[in-house]
Interface confidence: medium
């Protein structure tokens, strides 16, 4: 009821709590001498549903039949209206519309850990919109029943606070939940289980790993578990992997040997527990243990390549390059590389440890037969050395691969193709494709890249260290025993017209012709491989089309003669550069007047 209801009453029949779709009769009646002061027949009783008038009647009482009330609570208020005065509130009532509870479904119980307590969950079904009380009952051995009420609005979970003990693990327990409200009651189907069915062990803890004699092949995982645990699941993976290795063990008693771990790898380990072979559920996974396995000596051999450069009549420079071993081959932190240089006929040898680099340069005599061996060392030992005989890689012309081409292949890739050499193609043991950024000065500090290709291949896709709009000098070597032949080409993965033309730095007169010299375009403005230079000239102050001379691009060339200029005529000259994508803008303009005699 609402307010004190001093002036009258509101009654609701059949009840304040009704089933959805039911009809209610609401009666508002004034108490004696509580009507309008003079004219009791002028009493106007008005019934409001919330703030909306739904009925009125003159007299001492009002009856109203109400249908179609929505789920939830609806407030009805009765007011009295007298002439020349405000409406006076008489009384009110709340009507609660709902449904009987549905049968609770999917009742399930669990006890977390041997020392935990039993908690049950269920699905309530649709909302009753009424105060509904849930009672959870648990019956078990020795005629014992536990029960607990839940008075939350949305009750679908109850923790009994009781701990089931394993004295008789096969004893049956039965749980049942009953929902009751003003409109009815309903009980779930009973759920029957044993201790072993519902106790979910706590996850294992205190996980440790031991490597006997610092060896990855002698590895034991240790952990602690609750006392009744019979089964364990172990899962482990390298920290950078998404896939788990899984092992099931029975009666492990807190330890298990792992035999397939890789050396020098950080692993993540987790363990889960279960009380019975086919009853109950697995515990949550334990917290992760992260541990790095010990190093083992490297396997595999380094991929080694080299470059020779003529210094003078008696000396040559050898630059050695090698690739890092893969993580699985290095099997530890590589501390240094050991390079041994040996003169094969005289037996002289020199060994050096290289740290922090994957290249080494030395100067040796041009005479003699030289060989190098390179190996990688970690804390446990060294890889097998890679041995190479130093030879003139391009000396055998008949071994030179033919028709070498380089074409862009998607983003930052270049497809290099070739034909086998004229000399017996079956003599080729392997091809090596080498590439480096083209620098006009032939800078030996530019990083070298290479890949090896089987003798039956006639193409290779190069993608490592390839940048857009950069020109690469690409060489294909065919190797056969202690001989080699090579061919080279320029290539780029992406190109556009150069950003600027060459800068003419000098024009000199020589025997009736001129020699034009220019500065190379900066590498970052070439925008790919240059194909041609163009030299343009025309008479100063003339409107005629300029003449031009097109010169094929060669890396080392930066001057060119022109002999078609008239003496004592002032010419304007400029240059452009071309890639396969187009021509650059003009370089600087220079004026020149040939002083020589006319022909």
């Amino acid at each position: 009821k609402i307010d004190a209801c001093k002036r009258g009453d509101v009654t609701v029949k059949p009840s304040h709590v009704i089933l959805l779709g039911s009809t209610v009769n609401i009666t508002c009646s004034l108490k004696p001498r509580q009507g309008c002061f003079h004219y009791s027949r002028r009493n106007k009783l008005i019934l409001y549903k919330f703030d909306r008038r739904i009925n009125f009647h003159h007299g001492h009482s009002l009856n109203s039949q109400v249908t179609g009330l929505p789920l939830g609570t609806t407030l009805f208020v009765c007011k009295l209206a007298c002439i020349n005065s405000d409406e006076i509130q008489i009384c009110g009532a709340e009507i609660f519309v709902g449904v009987a509870p549905e049968q609770p479904q999917n009742l399930s119980c669990i006890q977390k850990g041997e020392q935990g307590t039993v908690a049950c969950t269920w699905e309530r079904g649709r909302d009753t919109h009424l105060y509904t009380e849930y009672t959870l009952q648990l019956s078990g051995p020795k005629n014992l029943t536990w029960q607990k009420q839940c008075k939350d609005i949305y009750c679908d979970y109850l923790d009994f606070g009781i701990n089931l003990t394993p004295e008789s693990p096969e004893s049956n327990f039965t749980a049942k939940v009953t929902a009751v409200n003003s409109l009815g009651s309903s009980s779930s189907l009973p759920s029957t289980f044993t201790f072993l069915d519902i106790v979910r062990p706590l996850p294992p803890w205190d996980i440790r790993i031991k490597f006997q004699k610092a060896s990855v092949s002698r590895c034991t995982l240790y952990w602690r578990d609750e006392g009744l645990v019979l089964l364990n699941r172990l899962r482990y993976r390298p920290s950078n992997s998404r896939l788990w290795n899984m092992v099931n063990v029975t009666k492990a008693k807190g330890r298990h040997d792992l035999l397939d771990l890789k050396p020098f790898t950080e692993y993540e380990f987790q363990i889960s527990s279960k009380l019975h072979l086919y009853k109950g559920s697995w515990s949550d996974w334990s917290e992760s243990l992260r541990a790095q396995t010990p190093e083992e000596e490297p396997t595999g051999m380094l991929d080694v390549w080299y470059m020779k450069r003529h210094i003078d009549y008696s000396r040559q420079q050898i630059s050695l390059f090698w690739k890092n071993l893969s993580v699985s081959e290095a099997r530890g932190k590589i501390l240094h590389y050991q390079v041994t240089l040996q003169e094969l006929t005289g037996g002289k040898a020199m060994t050096q440890n290289i740290t922090g680099h994957t290249s080494w340069t030395t100067v040796i005599p041009r005479t003699g037969n030289w060989a190098v061996a390179v190996s990688a060392a970690n804390s446990k030992g060294s890889s097998l050395p890679t041995r190479i005989n130093i030879m003139n890689l391009c000396e055998a012309g008949l071994l030179a691969p033919r028709q070498v081409s380089a074409n862009s292949e998607g983003m930052d890739n270049i497809l290099v193709t070739w034909q086998p050499p004229r000399k017996d193609p079956s003599a080729v043991q392997e091809y090596v494709v080498e590439w480096r950024e083209l620098h006009p000065g032939g800078d030996t500090q530019v990083p070298l890249n290479w890949l090896r290709s089987r003798p039956y291949n006639v193409s290779a896709l190069i993608s490592e260290n390839i940048k857009s709009y950069i020109c690469y000098e690409i060489r294909v070597y065919a190797l056969s025993g202690d001989q080699g032949g090579c061919s080279s080409i320029l290539g780029n993965s992406k190109h556009k017209a150069p950003l600027s033309g060459p800068h003419i730095n000098a024009i000199t007169e020589e025997k009736g012709s001129i020699l034009i010299s220019w500065n190379s375009i900066p590498v970052q403005e070439q925008m790919g491989c240059l194909l041609h230079y163009r030299i343009y000239w025309k008479e100063r102050d003339s409107n005629s089309q300029p003449q031009l001379c097109e010169i094929p691009y060669r890396v080392s060339q930066n001057s060119h003669p022109i002999n078609s200029l008239q003496p004592r005529v002032t010419y304007v000259l400029w240059m452009t550069a071309l890639t396969a994508a187009g021509e650059s803008s003009h370089g600087n303009e220079r004026e020149f007047c040939l002083q020589g005699k006319a022909n």
């Epitope: 020795k142 009781i162 701990n163 003990t165």
Partner: nanobody, 124 residues
């Protein structure tokens, strides 16, 4: 030191009612689990009902289910056993017992603290 004090026993006719009280001191209600046991002459002590004072979980043995109701007041640290529809076979000394861990058991060995007992006689 934990002390338990029972009250409310007496003589009652078959079909009548009694309410037993067990007041605990020296222990926090948040950890208190109270059980009622009874013992008739020449018989073993048997479990009747139990309650967790903080959680409200109740337990009953089958022979009293529906007739006896256990309840608790964790402000007063007191447990009550409302006994309705009493029968002559309910005649016994009723003991109140307490422990700090709530486990599924029917054994009086798991209770650490005991009251002196109160006599309930059902007779016409």
């Amino acid at each position: 030191q934990v002390q338990l004090q029972e009250s409310g026993g007496g003589l009652v006719q078959p079909g009548g009612s009694l309410r037993l009280s067990c007041a605990a001191s020296g222990i926090s209600s948040s950890r208190l689990h109270v059980g009622w046991f009874r013992q008739s002459p020449g018989k073993e002590r048997e479990f009747v009902a139990a309650i967790s004072l903080s959680g409200g979980t109740q337990a009953y043995t089958d022979s009293v289910k529906g007739r006896f109701t256990i309840s608790g007041d964790n402000v007063k640290n007191t447990a009550y056993l409302q006994m309705n529809s009493l029968r002559p076979e309910d005649t016994a000394v009723y003991y109140c017992a307490a422990r700090e861990r709530f486990i599924w058991t029917w054994s009086d060995l798991t209770y650490d603290y005991w009251g002196q007992g109160t006599q309930v006689t059902v007779s016409s």
